[in-house]
């Protein structure tokens, strides 16, 4: 014969453990049900009564089977650098990440508590590392023979133009101007692979809070006004 | 010029613990990110993690990530990846590689090799 | 982890020849593919970046192309120095990875 099947509560056989989605109340000493997500313990159950559940309130939630007293409150809402990526509802708390242009510079366990704008190189330097969803923009030099005109979160530096004939040389910062005749892009004078010096350290101006456009968080950027800045994965 | 100029090679035992160095030389090693990268014989190229000088941030492969320590010394212009517990598949070239604002590795150490035998 | 996969392993072509090397990607990386040329006893050095991009100094018989999930890299004239190993390198995603390599030989 098949064993009979035990319904809630019951007291377990010694040295056994309660079934999936059952606890043991140590009060009652039985094994009893546990609330679903979405459900909290509303009256815990005794040796002749299951346990009660009852529906999370609004702007509260439970994730786990569970037989907690009273349900998670959902967090704040948004700021306003950050975006909702999962709304508060009964089974699941609100999330929200940073907003484009910005990244988590203080994290919680699920989203981000703190975001902040991504740094954006100056002139004469360009995104040595992009921003990812956690991590800033690392700006540095740009190499000989490359450039970037730009104050920008997303621009590595690009190849100076090739001229026929040069009006004025490209440097770190400014492109390279050819006299009337058509110039190519083939290949940069110069094989040293080294930075240009710079006069001053400072490799990026003061993060703003309006980026002037949405990150690339790929690790190389688009030349000149080619296709837009990709997304990444990040890390 | 720009030199990116390694220790010499080094013979270590399994368990053991190996430091490099990488100097960089005729530019300030914060004008760059540093990365390391493995070439075990015969084999492809694998990347370890990198440093920047300027803050002393780090971002490792989670491969390396329990026994690699990336760091930067920038009053000599020299930066150091150290392997701790070592293994006989270990045994590989180690490169340094600097990262411009180009963002791709513009420039290369000449490489240390490094063999673990007991 | 994305995972570069260079083809042929070898490849074995004349000199003056045109040779093109390929590397897919595992998944989208969009433009952020690196080649690197290899040489024995040597460094790598940086041929292309952002796919299509020719680093400082790299003659112009070399070219890159593609995006998403499929890279070429093509030498359009082989000279005898361009008998090398070739590695793409994806740069979208941590880990940054490597293809496996690709050996061009003189026919």
């Known amino acids: 014969l098949p064993a009979q099947v035990a319904f809630t509560p019951y007291a377990p056989e010694p040295g056994s453990t309660c079934r999936l989605r059952e606890y043991y109340d140590q009060t009652a000493q039985m094994c009893c049900s546990k609330c679903s997500p979405g459900q909290h313990a509303k009256v815990f159950c005794t040796k002749t009564s299951d346990t009660v559940c009852d529906s999370c309130e609004d702007s509260t939630y439970t994730q786990l089977w569970n037989w907690v007293p009273e349900c998670l409150s959902c967090g704040s809402r948004c700021s306003s650098d950050q975006v909702e990526t999962q709304a508060c509802t009964r089974e699941q708390n609100r999330i929200c990440t940073c907003r484009p242009g910005w990244y988590c510079a203080l994290s919680k366990q699920e989203g981000c508590r703190l975001c902040a704008p991504l740094r954006k190189c100056r002139p004469g330097f360009g995104v040595a590392r992009p921003g990812t969803e956690t991590s800033d923009v690392v700006c540095k030099p740009c190499a000989p023979g490359t450039f970037s005109n730009t104050t920008s979160s997303t621009d590595i530096c690009r190849p100076h133009q090739i001229c026929n004939v040069v009006a004025i040389p490209g440097n770190a910062s400014m492109d390279a101007v050819c006299t009337s005749t058509s110039p190519t892009r083939s290949m940069a004078p110069g094989a040293v692979h080294l930075p240009q010096p710079v006069s001053t350290r400072s490799q990026h101006t003061q993060p703003t809070p309006e980026p002037s456009t949405a990150p690339s968080t790929s690790f190389l950027l688009p030349m000149g006004p080619s296709p837009p800045a990709e997304g990444s994965t990040g890390d | 010029e720009v030199q990116l100029v390694q220790s010499g090679a080094e013979v270590k035992k399994p368990g053991a613990t190996v430091k490099i160095s990488c100097k960089v030389s005729?530019?300030?090693?914060?004008?760059?990110?540093l990365h390391w990268v493995q070439q075990a014989p015969g084999k492809g190229l694998e990347w370890m993690g990198w440093?920047?000088?300027?803050?002393?941030?780090?971002k490792y492969g989670q491969k390396f990530q329990s026994r690699v320590t990336i760091t930067a010394d920038t009053s000599t212009d020299t930066a150091y990846m150290e392997l701790s517990s070592l293994r006989s598949e270990d045994t590989a070239v180690y490169y340094c590689a600097a990262n411009s604002g180009t963002g791709t590795m513009d420039a290369w150490g000449q490489g240390t090799l490094v063999t673990v035998s007991s | 982890d994305i995972v570069m996969t260079q083809s042929p392993a070898t490849l074995s072509v004349s000199p003056g020849e045109r040779a093109t090397l390929s590397c897919k990607a595992s998944?989208?990386?969009?433009?952020?593919v690196d080649w690197y040329q290899q040489k024995p006893g040597q460094s790598p050095r940086v041929l292309i970046y952002?796919?299509?991009i020719r680093y400082t100094g790299i003659p112009a018989r070399f070219s890159g192309s593609g995006s998403g999930t499929e890279f070429t890299l093509t030498i359009s004239i082989l000279q005898s120095e361009d008998f090398a190993v070739y590695f793409c390198m994806q740069s979208k995603s941590y880990p940054i990875t490597f293809g496996q390599g690709t050996k061009l030989e003189i026919k």
């Open positions: 005729g530019y300030s090693i914060t004008d760059y990110l």
């Open positions: 952002k796919a299509s």
């Open positions: 998944q989208n990386v969009g433009s952020n």
């Open positions: 440093i920047d000088p300027e803050d002393a941030k780090t």
